[in-house]
């Protein structure tokens, strides 16, 4: 039975050149985190394997830098970075936990963020 | 260099029993997924099953559920694959493959060939 | 199951020519997708993973494309050395599946 619950970063702005954080948490489980995937829509951005380390997918690797922790930070933010991105957490026993965020990149200079949390 | 060697392979009866091996070098073994993967003669590629790193999560495809068995030993690096009540469609060549990631199979093994005939 | 259709099933083509393969999932399988090319007698060999990214050591001149349900692995410039049989295969889910192939022959 799958008890776990995933809290995300939500929906968040970020200025257009910046960077941002994405950051997803697993709570509520003992299960043991085998492996995250990140995906934005319908491509895979990076793998984080609890053995294997990081694979960050060769085309976004100039602008994909891995962590802190199981998280992804994204630099030099376009207005194509605006949209869903996925964090895929696979664990055992429980099986798989998705968590999502919507980024959107604005062009002012002023990026309201969404709600935060701290990961310890 | 990795390098993946089958083993086991040959000519059975139907409803007989083959065990097959893989044996596993120049890489961590034990960090890696591994699947087995068929081609019968003249036809494509269809998987048989997978096996997570640390054998907690095992897969299979419906063809073969309740008759074929996979594990590995990674004090051996090797995987297995156990074959009961073989059918002549169960004939092919079967290659064990490295699957980094769960998401890509980057090495194959050479294969080994399974007949199955009276 | 998630089924893979890949087109054409056969081509004939001369050296120096573009080749594009197409491989159609039956639902969405963002971009876990692979290529494979296979010679006859010998093991198949990953060219391009997640839809896009170049395996090691494969020629620049293999590209792959695509997300959701289309995908295509192009050659640039066929040479003699690319005539195979080309594989896709889904790892979204299991059961991984595969498309049927798609032989490229010479003209």
């Known amino acids: 039975m799958m008890t776990g619950t995933i809290e995300t970063t939500g929906n968040i702005s970020a200025e257009k050149g910046g960077s941002i954080i994405l950051q997803c948490h697993l709570s509520s489980t003992t299960a043991q985190v085998t492996q995250v995937n990140w995906e934005q829509q319908d491509q895979l951005l990076a793998i984080c394997n609890a053995d294997l380390g990081w694979h960050i997918s060769p085309s976004f690797k100039d602008r994909v830098a891995p962590g802190p922790g199981l998280g992804l930070t994204l630099q030099s933010l376009t207005v194509n970075d605006t949209g869903e991105y996925f964090c895929i957490y696979h664990t055992y026993p429980d099986g798989t936990y998705t968590g999502r965020i919507f980024l959107e990149v604005l062009e002012s200079s002023v990026a309201e963020h969404g709600a935060r949390f701290q990961i310890p | 260099e990795v390098q993946l060697l089958e083993s086991g392979g040959g000519l059975v009866q139907p409803g007989g029993s083959l065990r097959l091996s893989c044996a596993a070098s120049?890489?961590?073994?034990?960090?890696?997924?591994m699947h087995w993967v068929r081609q019968a003669p003249g036809k494509g590629l269809e998987w048989v099953a997978s096996?997570?790193?640390?054998?907690?999560?095992?897969y299979y495809a419906d063809s073969v559920k309740g008759r074929f068995t996979i594990s590995r030993d990674n004090s051996k690096n090797t995987l297995y694959l156990q074959m009961n009540s073989l059918r002549a469609e169960d004939t092919a060549v079967y290659y064990c493959?490295?699957?980094?990631?769960?998401?890509?199979?980057?090495?194959w093994g050479q294969g080994t060939l399974v007949t199955v005939s009276s | 199951d998630i089924q893979m259709t890949q087109s054409p099933s056969s081509l004939s083509a001369s050296v120096g020519d573009r080749v594009t393969i197409t491989c159609r999932a039956s639902?969405?399988?963002?971009?876990?997708l692979n290529w494979y090319q296979q010679k006859p007698g010998k093991a198949p060999k990953l060219l391009i993973y997640?839809?896009?990214s170049l395996q090691s050591g494969v020629p620049s001149r293999f590209s792959g494309s695509g997300s959701g349900t289309d995908f295509t692995l192009t050659i640039s410039s066929l040479q003699p050395e690319d005539f195979a049989t080309y594989y896709c295969?889904?790892?979204?889910?299991?059961?991984?599946?595969f498309g049927g192939g798609t032989k490229v022959e010479i003209k």
């Open positions: 493959a490295r699957g980094p990631y769960d998401v890509w199979l980057d090495y």
């Open positions: 639902q969405s399988i963002s971009s876990y």
């Open positions: 096996i997570k790193y640390s054998s907690s999560n095992k």
């Open positions: 997640a839809a896009s």
């Open positions: 120049g890489f961590t073994f034990s960090s890696y997924g």
């Open positions: 295969q889904q790892s979204y889910s299991t059961p991984l599946t």
